[in-house]
């Protein structure tokens, strides 16, 4: 199980309007230039077999790889909003850096990389996906974590 | 086909007890939280509880004490104890697969039993 | 615990017709907001989640909208086949969980 006081976040992290609408901004806009719209990366595969104690888990699992691998190689892009945006959320990742699920996670990592493999097999157009769900990812790392 | 089939619905006196069960076919209860919700005559959907993946199991405030929520993932069935039963009891109830997508989804479902609680 | 409230309670309408349905929060659920569709003696079918996805096989002629505390449920040409009666329910996390799932108390769309 996770050592669930360190998967937690404070709900105030996702109650600030400015942040919170320029991530949906962000969002928006990297989704009109996606042209796949039958993936769909944060969806009920993503969660498959992932009790309630262990989403917060899985989700900085997902938001760290949208960090390093995504939004860092992608930083030049939708601005301004991205200068802003990834601040943010990686300050989420920071406050996340404690939590950590005792046992086995095999299952979680398993659908975490199918994600990963998914955005990596798109190319650049996976990263664009990736931001264009940025609005899942913060909906979804509150609802996991608070 | 995913499934989902309740039974053990009927007639019980105020005070008695009953369970209720969800046969479940085509995913695997390792894999899915399930929820129960009923519906008295006429009346809007109710949350009862859910018990998750890991066995958890969670129930609204005025359930807990009297309903409890179990499952036996090898016959592949989710049950809805309820004790102490009263006439407001009467309704239709309900199982629901809880299919989290970043947020909790309640699909499909399955047909419901009838429980009516009358002396 | 959050209180879903839907109006009309019920209404009545034409094949054709364009129907709006709102929900409204106590409090602010994001999008964190599902539609249902139930007809009688049936159980409810997922239409809408996440305010506005719609699930899958549900008609175009279904969306959804808003976020926060006020919400709409959208039939752009109503079938014959639509005239059910309609729940919202929402999901409040970080609260307990005994009050982590509200429906709303429905709507009736009704044969004009």
């Known amino acids: 199980a996770p050592i669930s006081s360190h998967c937690r976040l404070d709900k105030s992290n996702f109650q600030q309007p400015y942040i919170t609408n320029r991530t949906f901004m962000l969002a928006k806009e990297a989704s009109l230039a996606d042209n796949n719209t039958d993936v769909r990366l944060i969806g009920e595969k993503l969660f498959h077999g992932v009790s309630m104690s262990e989403r917060c888990y899985l989700m900085k699992q997902v938001l760290n790889f949208t960090l390093e691998e995504v939004l860092f190689p992608q930083s030049d892009r939708f601005q301004p909003y991205m200068q802003e945006v990834v601040p943010f959320l990686a300050r989420l990742s920071n406050r996340l850096s404690t939590c950590h699920i005792e046992g086995d996670d095999l299952h979680i990592q398993r659908n975490v990389q199918k994600l990963k493999d998914t955005v990596k097999k798109l190319g650049e157009s996976g990263e664009i996906k990736a931001i264009g769900e940025l609005d899942l990812l913060f909906m979804s790392l509150r609802n996991a974590c608070i | 086909e995913v499934q989902l089939v309740e039974s053990g619905g009927g007639l019980v006196q105020p005070g008695g007890s009953l369970r209720l069960s969800c046969a479940v076919s085509?995913?695997?209860?390792?894999?899915?939280?399930m929820i129960w919700v009923r519906q008295a005559p006429g009346k809007g959907l109710e949350w009862i509880g859910i018990i998750d993946i890991d066995g958890s199991t969670y129930y609204a405030s005025w359930a807990k004490g009297r309903f409890t929520i179990s499952r036996d993932s090898s016959k592949n069935t989710v049950y809805l104890q309820m004790n102490s039963l009263r006439a407001e009891d009467t309704a239709v109830y309900y199982c629901?697969?809880?299919?989290?997508?970043?947020?909790?989804?309640?699909?499909?479902w399955g047909q419901g039993t009838l429980v009516t609680v009358s002396s | 615990a959050v209180v879903l409230t839907q109006s009309p309670s019920s209404l009545s309408a034409s094949v054709g017709d364009r129907v709006t349905i709102t929900c409204q929060a106590s409090?602010?659920?994001?999008?964190?907001l599902a539609w249902y569709q139930q007809k009688p003696g049936k159980a409810p079918k997922l239409l809408i989640y996440?305010?506005?996805t719609l699930a899958s096989g549900v008609p175009s002629r279904f969306s959804g909208s808003g976020s926060g505390t006020d919400f709409t449920l959208t039939i752009s040409s109503l079938q014959p086949e639509d005239f059910a009666t309609y729940y919202c329910?929402?999901?409040?996390?970080?609260?307990?969980?005994?009050?982590?799932?509200?429906f709303g108390g429905g709507t009736k769309v009704e044969i004009k």
């Open positions: 085509g995913f695997s209860l390792s894999s899915y939280a």
């Open positions: 996440w305010a506005s």
């Open positions: 629901a697969r809880d299919r989290f997508v970043g947020v909790d989804i309640f699909d499909p």
């Open positions: 329910q929402a999901c409040v996390y970080g609260n307990s969980a005994d009050s982590r799932y509200t």
């Open positions: 409090e602010d659920i994001y999008t964190n």
